[in-house]
């Protein structure tokens, strides 16, 4: 169970979805993607302190053990809980076509 949405750290420091603007060149996609020429990439960034947005019991245990054994047990990671699909117009051997990617953009985030 997700444990809490209260961030004990400075504002915006905890795990959340952030949008980063990236060109096709930034992403290394310029040789196979035609559009969009710039992508507003929504990604999960931030710390996972205490029991913040713990995805499940395993994440809660990980948080507790990380406090006890930080050298052995890493803190939970901020990762997508769900995704928004996105369409890319891409070059293929047979010509230009559409492809929808279901796991390209983070919709919301949790700690795991």
């Amino acid at each position: 169970a997700r444990n809490g949405d209260h961030c004990p750290l400075a504002a915006a420091a905890c795990c959340a979805a952030h949008t980063v603007r990236a060109s096709l060149e930034d992403l290394g996609w310029a040789d196979w993607v035609l559009s969009p020429r710039e992508v507003q990439v929504t990604m999960c960034i931030g710390a996972c302190p205490s029991q913040f947005r713990a995805a499940n019991m395993h994440a809660q245990i990980k948080t507790s053990l990380h406090r006890l054994k930080p050298d052995t047990v890493p803190a939970p990671c901020c990762v997508p809980a769900s995704y928004n699909p996105m369409v890319l117009i891409q070059k293929t051997d047979t010509g230009v076509s559409l492809q929808t990617y279901d796991d390209l953009l983070a919709k919301d985030c949790h700690c795991i």
Epitope: S35, N84, P85, M86, V87, I89
Partner: antibody
Framework: QVTLKESGPGILQPSQTLSLTCSFS??????????VGWIRQPSGKGLEWLAN???????YYNSALKSRLTLSKDTSNNQVFLKISSVDTADTATYFC??????????WGQGTLVTIS | QIVLTQSPAIMSASLGEEITLTCSAS?????MHWYQQKSGTSPKVLIY???NLASGVPSRFSGSGSGTFYSLTISSVEAEDAADYYC?????????FGGGTKLEIK
């Protein structure tokens, strides 16, 4: 497989409001970069872009017709609606809806003929 | 708005002939699409972003251009190429189409 189908009244009288529906399948308007566009074509003439509606509900209209156009969508039922108010005989045309991916009318409906008479 | 002017309005070509259709824009555009519309059907894309062949389009079609001048070339015309051809820009709203070129086969 992407399909789109336009439906409309067929015949309308001048000054009335034209209501068109685009029903589609094979894609979702929840997908970033996806939209539906409307294009019309008077018989024997060229294509005229009317409007686009996007996944994020952004709407863009042909400036020459903007005051008369209204776009909306029902994402859960895969439908897009276009209303054109105060029609006259110059609005007689075949009306197409098309799937727009970013900047490309990738798939088109078969069109529906609307006659203002 | 950006006005696209296509020429010629009507072109007659023989089987196997190489032809070029042109599209001139009233202001510079970054890219151009080309659509083909056969009689009684809806348009379909031939060329995406100036020079990229759409999936399933025969390789005898090609596109080029930049700025205000773009062209569509058919290297060896076939009977099935009889159609109307439209250029289309989306660099700025309102999106616009050219007036079209009707290709007739002799």
């Amino acid at each position: 497989q992407v399909t789109l189908k336009e439906s409309g009244p067929g015949i309308l009288q001048p000054s009335q409001t034209l209501s068109l529906t685009c029903s589609f399948s094979g894609f979702s308007l929840n997908t970033h970069g996806m939209g539906v566009g409307w294009i019309r074509q008077p018989s024997g003439k060229g294509l005229e872009w009317l409007a686009n509606i996007w996944w994020n509900d952004d709407k863009y209209y042909n400036s020459a017709l903007k005051s008369r156009l209204t776009l909306s969508k029902d994402t859960s039922n895969n439908q897009v609606f276009l209303k054109i108010s105060s029609v006259d005989t110059a609005d007689t045309a075949t009306y197409f809806c098309a799937q727009v991916a970013w900047d490309w009318f990738a798939y088109w409906g078969q069109g529906t003929l609307v006659t203002i008479s | 708005q950006i006005v696209l002017t296509q020429s010629p309005a009507i072109m007659s070509a023989s089987l196997g002939e190489e032809i070029t259709l042109t599209c001139s824009a009233s202001s510079s555009v970054r890219y151009m699409h080309w659509y083909q519309q056969k009689s009684g059907t809806s348009p379909k894309v031939l060329i995406y972003s100036t020079s990229n062949l759409a999936s399933g389009v025969p390789s005898r079609f090609s596109g080029s251009g930049s700025g205000t001048f773009y062209s569509l070339t058919i290297s060896s015309v076939e009977a099935e190429d009889a159609a109307d051809y439209y250029c289309h820009q989306w660099s700025s709203y309102p999106w616009t189409f050219g007036g079209g070129t009707k290709l007739e086969i002799k």
